[in-house]
Structures are given as C-alpha cells and as structure tokens.
C-alpha cells in the first residue's frame, strides 16, 4: 500500500504563437481545480476506462479575474498535493490523465458552472520510494508543469511496496525463508501482503492474503465491531434495536453520471465512464471540437467543426487511443529475457538487466559471484541472476558490512535487559521471569515485577506485556 502524490507547479500559456484567451474575465471570474486519474500502465485500456489505480480531485484555487488587455498569465493554483492512495502493489508503469477544470463564479442559475480547460495524458515508469519526477505536458496552447512520486505506507517498503518490514516474530532470527530488512537488521522482510482492504488498525495477517481480526473486531476485513456483526441487510438505515452499523447509500446509487455515462464505485467515491464526446467528473461536458485541441502527442484532429459532429484523432506512430493519449506498448511483447526491465524510450527499446545478466536483451548469464566479495567472513551464494551474501553471526546487509545490533528488536520479554554478546545476545530477566528471552513468568499468579494476570482476565484472555 502507498500513496501517489502529484504537485502542480504551474498552468498557463505554452511557448510559441497563439496564446490562449484567459479563461476568466471581469464579467466571469473563475477559479481552477485539477483532477488526476491513474491506471496500471501495462493494461490496454481505453481512455474512457475507470481509473483502476485511483483518482483524486484538488481543492479549488484562488478566484482569478483577468486584467483587461493583459496576456493570460500563469493562473493561480490550488494549495497542496493531489494524493491518490493505492491499496495493493505499485505497478511500476502507470498511465495518468490530468484534467484542468474551470469553475465559473458568475451569477448563473443553479450554482457554479464547470468546464474542462485542458486534458493531458501520458504513460510513465516510476519506482515507489524514489525522488520527485518533474514533467511538462502541453494541451493545445496550454502548458502544465508538475511533479509526481509514489511512496509506500509503512510497513510496506520496496519499489513496488510489496515487501513488509516487521519486528522479528522470533527473538533470535527471521522465520523460514524470510530475510532481515536491510538496513533495518532488527526487522524481518516478510513477503506478506494481507488481503486487500484488511483494516490496518484492527486486522493483521501471518500468511499472504489473509485478514485476521484483533479481539473485538470481525468481518472479512476486520472493520466491523463484534457487537455490530449481526446485521443482515447489506445496505440500509441503521437499526436501533440491533445496534447495527450499516453503510448508507452507495456513491453510484441514482447514477450521478450524465449523458449515458456508467458509474463504478472507487475506494473513495465514484468514477464515471463517459461515452465518446463527453467528459468531466459526471460526463457533463459535451461539444468538444477540434478547436479545443483534443488530440494529444501530435495527433491530427479531423471533423468536429461544430459541437454536434464528432471529431476523430489520427495518431502518429507509437500512440493510440481516442485522443492519442496512450503510447503503444512495445514492451508488452516482453523482449527482455531473464527478468529484465523493458523501457520504451519512444525512439528505441532498452532492457535494464537484473544483476547477473547482460546483453541488449539480457540474454547473457554472468557468474553471479564473480568478483563479488562478502565482508566479515560471509560467503557468496549464487542464484536467480543475483548474488547474495550469507553473513556470519553478528553481521548483515547486502555485503555483510553492517554490524547487526542483536538488541535492537527488543528480544527480551517482560522487561528483561538485553546485552549484546560476541555470540549473539544475552537476556537478564526481571525478577519472577525466566527463559532464554524472559518469556516465561515463574509464578504467573504470584507477586512479580510485572503481573502476568491482571485482575478481571479469565484464562484464555490475551495479556499485553512490553
């Protein structure tokens, strides 16, 4: 799990002739807001398909009124980032659509009117956890400058947010098949992804794909308090007699999408899939013509001279989609061998090879351990096109150069003191406890430094010790 973050830096006239008219005027003051839509980049989806990775809407920007006779400047922007949370793995390659919307603040009947000013789209490769990436996109005579990044939400780490770093389950080592998390040698890397949507507060998992509930919570995603789990109706008003917590109407109830658009629920709200010729949050924007510059990436717009006739975008080589907003994915043929990463640079394909492989298509297998030294008595282990060091006791990291602190994971229970030792660690137990890690109270119902059974707990109840 993690968050995709988008920072809009500027929106204004692009370079070159034909500066656009200001979208606002003294008669019609307006303000801008932005919408971002994300889709997994390797899926061959139409431009109108739902935002499978998520979508977000910015706040409204400051009100702007054009100064008479002045060229359209960069327009005032909303504050803050646009954040799109994603629940599962970050796909690495993604498609985006960023829409700039104008909200007119005149005296129209029925409140403010919205209209789409510009729409840019693209496809990018991005690793989670990396630095901000800067971008410039043009739509007609407008230019949008922005930065974006993807970051993982703890405890997820890695370029796809699929690795989890958790405190060690066992005191002295990671479980079978689990490695220490570099550089956090006191934590274990677990290839553990709980069921999508599993409550981070009330659920946990010990095996991938499961969602186990902490005491007092139930339901498939551990989101229902135990006292409220006897509800039968899937949706409807709350029942005073049963105390059921029942969700209210769904975001798609009554279909908020206009002009024949179809509605699909998203984790945060809803998404409208619009028929051709309609756009906007609720498919309320119509009458797009070639004058609006709807074809991206150098596409040629044909037809659509008046709002009642559809336009067609003739796309240049390498692009497709009804608005030429999608780059043709030549990487879908998987030309890179041995797990190499395919990069479509537009003018050429490039393969980024995994460690241990080389060649234009990563076709050459190298000796993984050749020239690789493991420090501090570690031994090199070949396999899977990457070398790995099996480190001597007390050392960790990729090349065994990091000294592991055996006490960092608080391996001594019940207030025991941990001491690093040349052979590992030693626990000095608090009075009344024993065991290699002080995990066993000697007399659990007697007086001891930390009582093992606080009053009111029955056998079988969990008790917490720090």
């Amino acid at each position: 799990a993690g968050v995709f973050e988008l920072q809009i830096h500027s929106f204004g006239p692009g370079p070159g002739p034909g500066a656009p008219r200001s979208p606002c005027s003294a008669r019609l003051p307006c303000r801008l807001f932005f919408r971002v839509c994300l889709k997994p980049g390797l899926s061959e989806e139409a431009a109108e398909s739902p935002c499978a990775l998520g979508a977000a809407l910015s706040a409204r920007g400051p009100v702007y009124t054009e100064q008479p006779g002045a060229p359209a400047p960069d327009l005032p922007l909303p504050d803050g980032l646009l954040q799109v949370p994603f629940r599962d793995a970050w796909p690495g390659t993604f498609s985006f659509i960023i829409e700039t919307w104008r909200e007119e603040l005149g005296d129209q009947i029925g409140g403010p009117a919205w209209s789409l000013l510009a729409r840019v789209a693209g496809r990018r490769r991005l690793a989670a956890g990396g630095p901000w990436a800067r971008d410039i996109q043009r739509a007609g005579a407008w230019e949008l400058r922005f930065s974006y990044r993807a970051r993982c939400e703890p405890p997820a780490v890695g370029t796809a947010c699929t690795r989890l770093c958790r405190p060690r389950s066992a005191p002295s080592r990671c479980g079978p098949g689990l490695r220490p998390c570099a550089p956090l040698e006191d934590e274990c890397e677990a290839p553990l992804v709980c069921r999508a949507g599993c409550s981070p507060e009330h659920g946990f998992c010990e095996q991938p794909g499961e969602c186990r509930c902490l005491e007092g919570w139930t339901g498939p995603l551990c989101t229902v308090p135990v006292s409220t789990s006897s509800c039968l109706s899937p949706r409807g008003p709350s029942s005073a007699t049963t105390g059921c917590l029942v969700p209210g109407p769904g975001p798609c109830d009554g279909n908020p999408c206009a002009n024949g658009g179809s509605c699909s629920e998203t984790p945060r709200s809803f998404e409208c899939t619009c028929p051709r010729g309609f756009y906007g949050l609720r498919c309320e924007v119509s009458g797009v013509t070639c004058a609006d510059g709807p074809c991206f990436n150098g596409g040629l717009c044909v037809g659509g001279a008046d709002p009642d006739s559809a336009y067609i975008c003739h796309c240049p080589p390498g692009f497709q989609g009804s608005n030429c907003e999608k780059r043709v994915d030549r990487c879908s043929l998987q030309p890179c061998r041995n797990g190499g990463l395919c990069l479509d640079l537009g003018h050429a394909l490039r393969c980024r090879c995994r460690a241990g492989f080389a060649g234009p298509r990563c076709e050459h297998d190298l000796d993984d351990c050749a020239g690789r030294a493991c420090a501090n008595g570690g031994t090199c282990v070949e396999g899977g096109g990457a070398h790995r060091c099996s480190c001597a006791l007390g050392f960790g990291g990729r090349d065994c150069r990091e000294r592991a602190d055996p006490c960092a994971a608080r391996p001594c229970a019940h207030g025991g003191r941990c001491y690093a030792h040349f052979s590992g660690l030693v626990c000095a137990c608090a009075p009344g406890y024993m065991g290699a890690r002080c995990e066993f109270p000697v007399h659990p119902d007697g007086a001891s430094a930390l009582p093992a059974a606080p009053p009111g707990l029955r056998p079988g109840d969990p008790q917490r010790y720090l």
Epitope: P167, R168, S169, A170, A413, G435, A452, R464, L466
Partner: nanobody, 117 residues
C-alpha cells in the same frame, strides 16, 4: 487471537507415564514461545517446562530428566512427555503461549493430572 486447548490428562499410577498435548490456533507455534505450568491444590501456579520460539528448551529442577517438552510445527502443537510420575506431580496443567509479534500472553483452560495408586 491465539487459542490453546490442552488434552491428555487423567489418572495414572506412580512411576507411570502420560503425554499432554496443547493444540494452538490463531498463530503458528514456531512463532510462539510456549510452556507448561501446573497448579496443585492450595498452591501457586508454577512453571514446569518451556520451549522458546528458537527451539531452545528449559525445565525446573524437580522435573529435569523426567519430563520432555517438544513442538510439532506441522500439527501446530506442543507436548509434555511425563515419565516416572510422582504423587507430587498431581496438579492442573496449563498450556501457555507468548506471542512475539504482539507481546501478548495466552493461557489454555487446563487439564487435570492425578498420580495416585
């Protein structure tokens, strides 16, 4: 939540043998430190034997050489093999678990062992 269910208790003559079982659910026993405790009538509950998450074992002096604690990861269970039983071993035997991920302790409901001729 970890749940522990003991079984195997009963009546046995002095010098006899008995094996207690503790079946765990809600977590893998390989990730738990587990122990057997006993409580004789009118006495405090006391630790008998323990097995840490890393597999190391420990015993109180009065049972060393007679009792053996073991773990079967496949069956998600912990056992206490009791040989050369004595009358003073008569007690309710409880299974105990310490879960390292949450630092919570759990108890079973107990099983009665009576050593009598």
């Amino acid at each position: 939540e970890v749940q522990l269910v003991e079984s195997g208790g009963g009546l046995v003559q002095p010098g006899g043998s008995l094996t207690l079982s503790c079946a765990a659910s809600g977590s893998r026993v390989s990730f738990l430190s587990m122990a057997w405790y006993r409580q004789a009538p009118g006495k405090k509950r006391e630790l008998v034997a323990g097995i840490s998450a890393d597999g190391s074992t420990m015993y109180i002096d009065s049972v060393k050489g007679r009792f053996t604690i073991s773990r079967d990861n496949a069956k998600n269970s912990v056992y206490l093999q009791m040989n050369s039983l004595r009358a003073e071993d008569t007690a309710v035997y409880y299974c105990y678990a310490y879960r390292w991920t949450t630092r919570l302790t759990y108890w079973g409901q107990g099983t009665l062992v009576t050593v009598s001729s």
